[in-house]
Amino acid sequence: MMTGTIETTGNISAEKGGSIILQCHLSSTTAQVTQVNWEQQDQLLAICNADLGWHISPSFKDRVAPGPGLGLTLQSLTVNDTGEYFCIYHTYPDGTYTGRIFLEVLESSVAEHGARFQIP
């Protein structure tokens, strides 16, 4: 029986050109995390494997950094980064848990009066 729950950073609004951290946390289970996949729509962004470490998809290498922890840092944000991101936890013996985070990237003029975030 899958007892775990995924907590996420929550949905985020961010400024074009800025950076944000996407994070998920698996709790309420003793299952072992074997791998975490980060995806957007049907695209694989990155994998963190318990044995092999991080692999960033070649097409995202310039703008995606691993961590902190099992999270993912997205840099040099563009409007086209707006969308839903998935953290997919592969665990044993429970199976797969999925968290969802929506990111809206705003033009600077909009972000000034919106809820915008940028990591220095």
């Epitope: 929506f102 009066h113 809820a115 975030f117």
Partner: antibody, heavy 119, light 112 residues
Framework: EVHLQQSGPELVKPGASMKISCKAS????????MNWVKQSHGKNLEWIGL????????SYNQKFKGKATLTVDKSSSTAYMEFLSLTSEDSAVYYC????????????WGQGTSVTVSS | DVVVTQTPLSLPVSFGDQVSISCRSS???????????LSWYLHKPGQSPQLLIY???NRFSGVPDRFSGSGSGTDFTLKISTVKPEDLGMYYC?????????FGGGTKLEIK
């Protein structure tokens, strides 16, 4: 002035599918997320999902995944929601609603489309 | 999914009353950057829902200042300082912090 004009009421048979349209005017269509909301029995509101006109990306409430398909036609500034394999549970009023940038809220709503599923 | 609970279900009022509607969520609506995506809507019979408050306490364009929003974490309140006839209808809160977005069950503001 922002305006969202939805298609007219639908009477459809169980098992059929239908497509509702939402034509946007008064703003730049690709700059704002479009949401879809279901209102059943004149009370409960449920978020069906959203579409990003700029890149076609979608996000669905899992309850409606496989039931609803969201698309846009940028050339006509129109958002569409297709509903598949309709049952009596799908009888409701459906709204499109523009996303308020930066705040995950809905600032302008269409007039609603009433859908009745009946044989 | 985040469960959003509104109270009361029904709120009988007299014009001129001050009223409060409560909205509670099953988990915190503050994201990791400190923003909280909680909004309030009024749905009048025969009309579309209209946005009143976004981001907990920001009044939307054209919304009278008798409407105010407050709260944090899991506990939020909409206040109407002096109820007017045009305020009658169903009030809903919506959380947009977590996927999927979820509405409260609604509060019916009606005349006593």
């Amino acid at each position: 002035e922002v305006h969202l004009q939805q298609s007219g009421p639908e009477l459809v048979k169980p098992g059929a599918s239908m497509k509702i349209s939402c034509k946007a005017s008064g703003y730049s269509f690709t700059d704002y997320i479009m949401n879809w909301v279901k209102q059943s029995h004149g009370k409960n509101l449920e978020w069906i999902g959203l579409i990003i006109p700029y890149n076609g990306g979608t996000s669905y409430n899992q309850k409606f995944k496989g039931k609803a398909t969201l698309t846009v036609d940028k050339s006509s500034s129109t958002a569409y929601m297709e509903f598949l394999s309709l049952t009596s549970e799908d009888s409701a009023v459906y709204y499109c609603a523009r996303g308020l940038r930066g705040y995950y809220a809905m600032d302008y709503w269409g007039q609603g489309t009433s859908v009745t599923v009946s044989s | 999914d985040v469960v959003v609970t509104q109270t009361p279900l029904s709120l009988p009022v007299s014009f001129g009353d001050q009223v409060s509607i409560s909205c509670r969520s099953s988990q915190s609506l503050a994201n990791s950057y400190g923003s909280t995506f909680l909004s309030w809507y009024l749905h009048k019979p025969g009309q579309s829902p209209q946005l009143l408050i976004y981001g907990i306490s920001n009044r939307f364009s054209g919304v009278p200042d008798r409407f105010s929003g407050s709260g944090s974490g899991t506990d939020f309140t909409l206040k109407i300082s002096t109820v007017k006839p045009e305020d009658l209808g169903m009030y809903y809160c919506l959380q947009g912090t977590h996927q999927p977005w979820t509405f409260g069950g609604g509060t019916k503001l009606e005349i006593k």
